[in-house]
Every structure is written in structure tokens, then in C-alpha cells.
Interface confidence: low
């Protein structure tokens, strides 16, 4: 064999006896007829030698060390070569060592080409015998980062101040490349950063520096995990010890892109997070240890990356290709901010782009899936605009305000489905006709259904909320003067079962001047509660609303107001109420800003209640609540 090392290559080759074997016959290195058991070759030297036995690999090992000095001159960055070439070396178990020294302010990055590295613990060995031992430096102290095999997830290791990389190749291994390159980086301000890349499902076991011995005092080590968006990562601690801290606290911190509470801080004894979608970082922070009884901090943990379970494996098709002017947003329900870690909950488009919220628009067919441990953490909000621009075309036209079935089949609860109904100003008005008569939600008779319709003006300058209405009441239809939004809001998961009860038809009708008209057909045996729009804030200035209340021939209606006075104080104009019998046109007019509200009155025929507001002074608003109760007539008054 001949080994020639170029001058100033900073390479030293050492051939020495390996682990002693029980072989009876010894073996020697032979140079110029001299028999020796160790040979050192330095830069600029050329040595020819041989062995005294047929199988030197059973006796000797070879170490090739290259010192790279980044302190006094430029650093030779880039792909690291195996020098001398393995083809020129004797077939011994060989270890290539690269010792890089750099300033504390310089970061050094080892980049591993595929196959990436897999960390092994004490007592473990690599199946192919190829091992990578990596250590760093804190001042004069060497810190073992870890021992690694091939076929893993570790793609990069960043350190500063220096790095020692030892690549051990068994004598029979044909490898002739180092498999890594070195790059310079800015200071990382910590012991090291290990990047672990998952292409698909898999797991990685990783350890703190110096494991199973103690992690250096008051140091920081970070692992960066790159996880495809459609997969989920879970962290579990396999083994850890805590040292005795004098100052600070030993902890792990998670940094999750998109989280509002980064970093998420955990004690080592806490249950660690699972079900994380996408990339994340984990950092181990040591403390100032007690000088007398330091103890040791060490951590061995596993990251498991897998396809999400159950619901999350499914692909849902949301076909909005035949919809117009509609958007569907899936987003997190509002929750109280908590410092406690909550696993990510994501919705994915085409299983690739995952985010905490997603908006789908009409005109396309969308494929979505979920990355979420608990889909009740998400809800859906949908907006659809139905607009009429040409009153001649729209008049008398009807549209069904119905939640499309494919939206109901998504595994996420529908929160709001809002229809924005737009009409040409002063040309058309709207009428809402429910499939089932509606009840107005009041404190006295609250809705207890799984959903309600919230009806409000959709004119930006107008603050007018007509109320919340649910199925099972006496309101047969609601007419409104101009643009409104109707929002179907769900209150319970049982909405899925009750979805058949939803059904509201909107029709464009000739324009009328009142803000709203409620047609009420009370049922016998039940008290109908009705209240003016904008309850709690007061009917807007100069607004007029009416109730058309039907009374069957064999019944009498009792109209009751729940206050003695309206409480309104007018700044300008008058507030009044008209109660008019529809058959005789006889009417009573009450000045709401002056008069006492009428005592309970009985009506044998259908009648109108019309309330018109003045411009009230602030704080003295017009809010009225009244009820209608039917009872059988005892005497025929016709």
C-alpha cells in the first residue's frame, strides 16, 4: 500500500490496532522490513507499507483526520471529499474525522444528502455499520451531539464555535463519498439546531446532547421538524431526567408557525403535544445548576408522524360550481386564549395546502380534508348574495333560502349561513315566507330550537335588527322594505337532524314604505310574544313597523303590552301607535311619547298594530314587547 498526503492538506492518517481479538496469530504493519503496530502519516509524507497477515481488517483500524481551520483564514465550505480516496486505502475499518474550528460568532452547518441520518442511543449499532458521530464545542469542552446511522430524517445540524464529525465505515463498505457538506451560517446563539425532515409517515428518536450523560448547564438546543402539511406529528418523551436548578427552570418550548401563543412552554413532565399539522420547532432549555448537587438534565424523545386518523382521512367534495356569489369559510371557533398548548386544527384544500381557516368560493368544485383531533373546534360560516338589479325581471321571483345538502354533509358544524338579499332602491321590497311558521325569540319565550334566523338590515348606514326567529311559532311572513341579511345560525349539533325544518323562501315584491311588516297567525292555546326591532337599542329614528294579526272567526285575541309607558322621549317628531280593526277600519291612536300604553284589549277580528318612532333623545329609546293570546269566543258578536 502507498499513502501520500499532500503538503498543507492538514490530514493525518493513523493506522492502529483495533479492538483486541482472540486470534492466536498476531499481525503487524511492515515498513522497510520493520514490524510495527501503529503507523502515523502526516501532511507532506509518502509511506509505502504492507501487513504481515492475510486479513488485516481483523486486527487494524485506520483513522483519517482532517483539521479545518476557520479561525485564521477562509473556510473551505461545500461538499466534503473523502481524502485520501477510499480506493487508495487498505481495506480496514476506517474512520474519517473532520475537525472544524471556528469563531464563536460563526455558525457551521452540516448538510446531509439523502439518505438522511437517524440518531441512535447508547448500546445501539447501525445495520450497515456506517456511523456518524458528531460533536461540538463549548469553549474547551467537547459536547457529543449524537451518533447517527443512515436512512433517517436528520438533514442538517447547525453548530457554532466548532464541529467534529467522525464517519465510520466498515472495511467491506463500498462508500466513497462523505455524504455531507459544510456551510457557514450566522451565529445560532445556542448549542445546536438539528433539522429533521419527514417526507411521509415515520418516526424519529432524538436525544439531548451528551445523552445519556447530562446536557450542558444553562444551554439551549433546538430541533426543527419539517412535516408535510397533510400529516400529523406527535411528540412523546421516552426518557428524561431533571437536574437540580438554582436559577431558571428546565423546560421545553414549542414554536408552531401560525400559533398565537408562541412559544408554547412545557415542563418535561407534562404531556407533550400531539396532532400537530405542519412544521414545528422544539427547544430544550437547561438551567443554572446547584454547584453542590447538580444532577443531570437529559432527554430522549420520539416524534411520530402519521396520517391523521378517522375523519381526517376522508376527502370531502364541496361542489359550489353551480352556486353564484357564495363563499364558505371553515374557521376555528372563538375560544378563550390559553397558554396551554392545543394541537393544531387545520383544514386542507386538495390535501396539500392546510391552514387554520379556509374560504371556498362559488363557481368551483373543491376537495377538502381535515387535520384536526377534534372537529368541534371548527365551524363553518357561509355567505351568499342574492341580488336583483332589474326590478322588472325580479318582481314576484322567489328563491329558496336553504342550506345546500353537501354543506350539511361536511363533518364541521355550520355556525352561520347568511343570505344577503339586495333589491333596487325604492323599486322592490322583500317578503320572507318560512316553511314552518316562526317564533320571535324573546326573554319571555326564548327559542329552544337548534337554529334560528337572524334578520337584519343590510344597508351599511342603517342599524336595524329585526330579531331572531325560530320554527314553531305564529309568524307567517316577514315583509321588509329594503336590503336585508338573513342568517341561519345553528345552536346545537342536532341541527343536522333538524335541518329538514329549515326552509325560508324570499320573494321580491312591489316596494312599500314601512321598514317591516310581520304577518302573525296565532295558534290557539299559545301566547305569541312580539317585540319591536332593535330590542335593547331601540327602534331607529323615524322608523315604522307593523304587525298584521289574524284572528279566526271563532276566537278572540287579547293584546297585552308589558309596560305602562313606552319610555321614549322625542327630540323631534312624534312617536305613535295605531291599532286598527281590519274589518271596520276603526282605529285607536296612542301617542307613545305621552300616553300610557293601552290596557289589555280584546279583538274579535283581524287587526293591525303599527308603531312609528320619532327622533328620540339618546338613552330614551322605543322598545315595546307585547303578546297576543287567542281564546274561544263565548258569544257570537257578528
Amino acid at each position: 500500500f502507498e499513502i501520500a498526503l499532500p503538503r498543507e492538506s492538514n490530514i493525518t492518517v493513523l493506522i492502529k490496532l483495533g479492538t483486541p481479538t482472540l486470534l492466536a496469530k498476531p499481525c503487524y504493519i511492515v515498513i522497510s522490513k520493520r514490524h510495527i503496530t501503529m503507523l502515523s502519516i502526516k501532511s507532506g509524507e509518502r509511506i509505502v507499507f504492507t501487513f504481515s497477515c492475510q486479513s488485516p481488517e481483523n486486527h487494524f483500524v485506520i483513522e483519517i483526520q482532517k483539521n479545518i481551520d476557520c479561525m485564521s483564514g477562509p473556510c473551505p465550505f461545500g461538499e466534503v471529499q473523502l481524502q485520501p480516496s477510499t480506493s487508495l486505502l487498505p481495506t480496514l475499518n476506517r474512520t474519517f474525522i473532520w475537525d472544524v474550528k471556528a469563531h464563536k460568532s460563526i455558525g457551521l452547518e452540516l448538510q446531509f444528502s439523502i439518505p438522511r441520518l437517524r440518531q441512535i442511543g447508547p448500546g445501539e449499532s447501525c445495520p450497515d455499520g456506517v456511523t456518524h458521530s458528531i460533536s461540538g464545542r463549548i469553549d474547551a469542552t467537547v459536547v457529543r451531539i449524537g451518533t447517527f446511522c443512515s436512512n433517517g430524517t436528520v438533514s442538517r445540524i447547525k453548530m457554532q464555535e466548532g464541529v467534529k464529525m467522525a464517519l465510520h465505515l466498515p472495511w467491506f463498505h463500498p462508500r466513497n463519498v462523505s455524504g455531507f457538506s459544510i456551510a457557514n451560517r450566522s451565529s445560532i446563539k445556542r448549542l445546536c439546531i438539528i433539522e429533521s425532515v419527514f417526507e411521509g409517515e415515520g418516526s424519529a428518536t432524538l436525544m439531548s446532547a451528551n445523552y445519556p450523560e447530562g446536557f450542558p448547564e444553562d444551554e439551549l438546543m433546538t430541533w426543527q421538524f419539517v412535516v408535510p402539511a397533510h400529516l400529523r406529528a406527535s411528540v412523546s418523551f421516552l426518557n428524561f431526567n431533571l437536574s437540580n436548578c438554582e436559577r431558571k427552570e428546565e423546560r421545553v418550548e414549542y414554536y408552531i408557525p401560525g400559533s398565537t401563543t408562541n412559544p408554547e412552554v412545557f415542563k418535561l413532565e407534562d404531556k407533550q403535544p400531539g396532532n400537530m399539522a405542519g412544521n414545528f420547532n422544539l427547544s430544550l432549555q437547561g438551567c443554572d445548576q446547584d454547584a453542590q448537587s447538580p444532577g443531570i438534565l437529559r432527554l430522549q424523545f420520539q416524534v411520530l408522524v402519521q396520517h391523521p386518523q378517522n375523519e381526517s382521512n376522508k376527502i370531502y367534495v364541496v361542489d359550489l360550481s353551480n352556486e353564484r356569489a357564495m363563499s364558505l369559510t371553515i374557521e376555528p371557533r372563538p375560544v378563550k386564549q390559553s397558554r396551554k398548548f392545543v394541537p393544531g386544527c387545520f383544514v386542507c384544500l386538495e390535501s396539500r395546502t392546510c391552514s387554520s381557516n379556509l374560504t371556498l368560493t362559488s363557481g368551483s368544485k373543491h376537495k377538502i380534508s381535515f387535520l384536526c383531533d377534534d372537529l368541534t373546534r371548527l365551524w363553518m360560516n357561509v355567505e351568499k348574495t342574492i341580488s336583483c338589479t332589474d326590478h322588472r325581471y325580479c318582481q314576484r321571483k322567489s328563491y329558496s333560502l336553504q342550506v345546500p345538502s353537501d354543506i350539511l354533509h361536511l363533518p364541521v358544524e355550520l355556525h352561520d349561513f347568511s343570505w344577503k338579499l339586495l333589491v333596487p332602491k325604492d323599486r322592490l321590497s322583500l317578503v320572507l315566507v318560512p316553511a314552518q311558521k316562526l317564533q320571535q325569540h324573546t326573554h319571555e319565550k326564548p327559542c329552544n330550537t337548534s337554529f334560528s334566523y337572524l334578520v337584519a338590515s343590510a344597508i351599511p348606514s342603517q342599524d336595524l335588527y329585526f330579531g331572531s326567529f325560530c320554527p314553531g311559532g305564529s309568524i307567517k311572513q316577514i315583509q321588509v322594505k329594503q336590503n336585508i341579511s338573513v342568517t341561519l345560525r345553528t345552536f346545537a349539533p342536532s341541527f343536522q337532524q333538524e335541518a329538514s325544518r329549515q326552509g325560508l323562501t324570499v320573494s321580491f315584491i312591489p316596494y312599500f314604505k314601512e321598514e317591516g311588516v310581520f304577518t302573525v297567525t296565532p295558534d290557539t292555546k299559545s301566547k305569541v310574544y312580539l317585540r319591536t326591532p332593535n330590542w335593547d337599542r331601540g327602534l331607529p329614528s323615524l322608523t315604522s313597523v307593523s304587525w298584521n294579526i289574524s284572528v279566526p272567526r271563532d276566537q278572540v285575541a287579547c293584546l297585552t303590552f308589558f309596560k305602562e309607558r313606552s319610555g321614549v322621549v322625542c327630540q323631534t317628531g312624534r312617536a305613535f301607535m295605531i291599532i286598527q280593526e281590519q274589518r271596520t277600519r276603526a282605529e285607536e291612536i296612542f301617542s307613545l311619547d305621552e300616553d300610557v300604553l293601552p290596557k289589555p284589549s280584546f279583538h274579535h277580528h283581524s287587526f293591525w298594530v303599527n308603531i312609528s318612532n320619532c327622533s328620540p333623545t339618546s338613552g330614551k329609546q322605543l322598545d315595546l314587547l307585547f303578546s297576543v293570546t287567542l281564546t274561544p269566543r263565548t258569544v257570537d258578536l257578528t
Epitope: 329558496s400 345538502s405 316553511a435 326552509g503 323562501t505
Partner: antibody
């Protein structure tokens, strides 16, 4: 051109099972949903349900839950309808039809398979 | 579920006459209604989709109206090959349903 070709007529005894196949050609099976429709002799059409050809998830109309199973073999572009514990009232022509997911109009139909259940 | 009621059950016309077939839904189903023609011993054939949209290859004499809850299929001038049973179908919500059919027969 698009074709749905169904298996031939079947005569079965009550209590037996039958499996009707529907082979799709001229398009990619997984691009459209597959629906099953029943027509009893001299009667109208009854929608039985559908199978999502992308995920294999079936949806059954209430009257067809239990004894009816929709399945797929995408490798041979074929959808199947299996009926177990056959009854005389299952005697009908069964059609497969191609539809749009969640909003189906059935633009192509199989020729129908007559299943007769008689002792 | 949406119940579709077709009328009349039978319509007797001579070739060249105008046919008007009605389909009424138990509630408003917007334009989620399709029409099919079925001849004896044959599978149904799609005629009209989404209440009024025409289908490629279907003669122009077939037209539909909607949306809402009342739908009409019109054959402007009946040809001999049009005598068949016509079904409307709701695609509004599960379960998808068919009307009971209208038989168009030769007078």
C-alpha cells in the same frame, strides 16, 4: 363514448343474495358519482342512494338501509350493488346512473338489470 | 324529504300538439329539478337539467321552466317518438326523489 354496462338478468329465491355489476367505460370512474335507481314492474323510479367513487363512501336512502350494499372496484371501473336476504318485493329493474356529486342529474344510465325474486 | 307530484298522470295528445307536463314540489327547491324520458324497456334519458337548462343532443322542442316549487316541461310540438313516460327528479336534498311520472300517450 360514455357507457354503463350492467350485468344480465337474475332469477333468485327469497332469502338469497344477488350482486349486480355496472361497468363504466369512456370516462374515469372516479370523476363522477355513481347512483342506483330501482324500478318495480309498472312502477316509477326510486332513488336508492349513491357511492362516492373517489372515497368509496356509500350513502343510502332510508328505504334501502340494511340489506343493500354499494361497492366499487376502481381497478376494473366497476360499481356493484349487492342485495341480501332477497324478498319478493325486491323484484325490479335496477339501474346504475352517472351523476354529479351532491347535485346529481343522471346524464348516463346503464341498460338496467332485472332481478326477479320468486320461490 | 321533497315530495314531487306530477300531473296529469296521463296526457293524451295527437302528434303536432303542444304538451305541458307539471311537477310540483312540496317546498321550494330553487332550480334543483331535472326531467327524464323513459320508453318501455329502456333506461331513462336526461332531457332537461336545473329546471330549464337544455341537454346536448335533446331536440329543441323540449323546454323547462322553474325555479321554485312549480315546474313545467313543455314539448312544443309532439312527435311520434315522444310518446313515453316523463319523470321529474329533485336534486335539492337527500334523499333525491322522483315524481310518480306522467304518461304521454297517443290520442
Amino acid at each position: 363514448q360514455v357507457q354503463l354496462v350492467q350485468s344480465g338478468s337474475e332469477l333468485k329465491k327469497p332469502g338469497a343474495s344477488v350482486k349486480v355489476s355496472c361497468k363504466a367505460s369512456g370516462y374515469t370512474l372516479t370523476d363522477f358519482s355513481m347512483h342506483w335507481v330501482r324500478q318495480a314492474p309498472g312502477q316509477g323510479l326510486e332513488w336508492m342512494g349513491w357511492i362516492n367513487t373517489e372515497t368509496g363512501a356509500p350513502t343510502y336512502a332510508d328505504d334501502f338501509k340494511g340489506r343493500f350494499v354499494f361497492s366499487l372496484d376502481t381497478s376494473v371501473s366497476t360499481a356493484y350493488l349487492q342485495i341480501s336476504s332477497l324478498k319478493a318485493e325486491d323484484t325490479a329493474v335496477y339501474y346504475c346512473s352517472r351523476g354529479r356529486d351532491y347535485d346529481p342529474h343522471f346524464d348516463y344510465w346503464g341498460q338496467g338489470t332485472l332481478v326477479t325474486v320468486s320461490s | 324529504e321533497i315530495v314531487l307530484t306530477q300531473s296529469p298522470a296521463t296526457l293524451s295528445l295527437s302528434p303536432g300538439e303542444r304538451a305541458t307536463l307539471s311537477c310540483r314540489a312540496s317546498q321550494s327547491i330553487s332550480d334543483f329539478l331535472h326531467w327524464y324520458q323513459q320508453k318501455p324497456g329502456q333506461a331513462p334519458r336526461l332531457l332537461i337539467k336545473y329546471a330549464s337548462q337544455s341537454i346536448s343532443g335533446i331536440p329543441a322542442r323540449f323546454s323547462g321552466s322553474g325555479p321554485g316549487s312549480d315546474f313545467t316541461l313543455t314539448i312544443s310540438s309532439v312527435e311520434p317518438e315522444d310518446f313515453a313516460v316523463y319523470y321529474c327528479q329533485s336534486a335539492h336534498s337527500f334523499p333525491y326523489t322522483f315524481g310518480q311520472g306522467t304518461k304521454l300517450e297517443i290520442k
